[in-house]
């Protein structure tokens, strides 16, 4: 008898045994996940004010309102400095107001003075129709004022604060544009 | 290593249409812009149209009107439907891809002919 209740007490004893490795189990994987989470939080954290305190525009890019133009340091032909803004995720700048040209034509001057950079305008060569590089039509006052003479394909660009017209294959510096990315904050 | 599949050339017919698909696979983390080149014989290489990676288009004076250029930014792959094709389109298109680590990769291209 006293045997008997001997190994029962031992089994117990065991039992208590595993259900107290089964708590610490549950402790340490509670713990652990508590610090994941903890960690989880953090992280977003970062990535919500890296989010909020990146820039609408790329380092040395100016903003605009929805737009960030970048001034290229180098001259290129039109159809090189085409390809120059599509490696930066971007297109030729394509001038949409008045307001918007007055913007660009101020910064210009502030940046470099008066030279010439290419934009995103070009002449068909059958029809003779500007048209900006997405296949739209320029608004009446931002066609370019002078009429290029040359019998090469005909390139738009801006210079101090008119757009005029050139061969394309002259060298400029240029102007690219893309959207400011906007804040999810 | 950096795959681009073309696919979708052909033989058609002037006034027909082709769609053109361009799928970039392998180890390519970020993509600024993807483009349609192409090349008839004797020519240089030239731009026909490109996306960037915000949907930003760029198109050549010649196709304005009749090519358009799409993107599907989930799968890596960009589209070109070509409609009222004419002769002077023919030629061998290639995809290229501009990556923002700074590199360019071409596809092998796919030939376009437009004849009656």
């Known amino acids: 008898k006293l045997l008997q209740v001997s190994t029962i007490a031992m089994q117990q004893q065991e039992k208590l045994i595993q259900q107290e490795r089964a708590l610490l189990n549950f402790t340490e994987w509670k713990r652990s996940c508590a610090l994941q989470m903890k960690y989880c939080q953090a992280f977003m954290q970062n990535s919500l004010s890296s989010a909020h305190n990146s820039s609408p525009c790329p380092n040395n890019w100016i903003q605009n309102r929805e737009s960030c133009y970048y001034v290229s340091e180098i001259w290129s032909i039109w159809h090189t400095s085409q390809e120059n803004c599509l490696k930066e995720g971007s297109t030729l700048l394509q001038i949409e107001s008045k307001e918007e040209m007055d913007f660009i034509t101020g910064s210009l001057r502030k940046i470099k003075g008066s030279y010439d950079y290419w934009v995103g305008l070009s002449q068909d060569g059958h029809s003779g129709r500007w048209l900006w590089q997405d296949g739209s039509s320029p608004s009446p006052g931002l066609l370019p004022a002078e009429r290029s003479q040359s019998a090469n394909q005909v390139c738009g660009y801006v210079k101090s604060n008119s757009l005029l017209s050139s061969n394309c294959s002259t060298w400029k510096y240029f102007i690219c544009e893309k959207y400011a990315l906007r804040s999810s904050v | 290593q950096v795959q681009l599949q073309e696919s979708g050339g052909g033989l058609v017919q002037p006034g027909g249409s082709l769609r053109l698909s361009c799928a970039a696979s392998?180890?390519?983390?970020?993509?600024?812009?993807m483009g349609w080149y192409r090349q008839a014989p004797g020519n240089q290489r030239e731009l026909v149209a490109a996306?960037?990676?915000?949907?930003?288009?760029t198109y050549a004076d010649s196709v304005k009107g009749r090519f358009t250029i799409s993107r599907d930014g989930a799968k890596n792959t960009v589209y070109l439907q070509m409609n009222s094709l004419k002769p002077e389109d023919t030629a061998v298109y290639y995809c290229?891809?501009?990556?923002?680590?700074?590199?360019?990769?071409w596809g092998k291209g796919t030939q376009v002919t437009v004849s009656s």
């Open positions: 290229k891809v501009f990556a923002a680590s700074g590199m360019e990769y």
């Open positions: 996306i960037t990676n915000q949907g930003r288009v």
């Open positions: 392998g180890s390519i983390s970020s993509i600024n812009a």
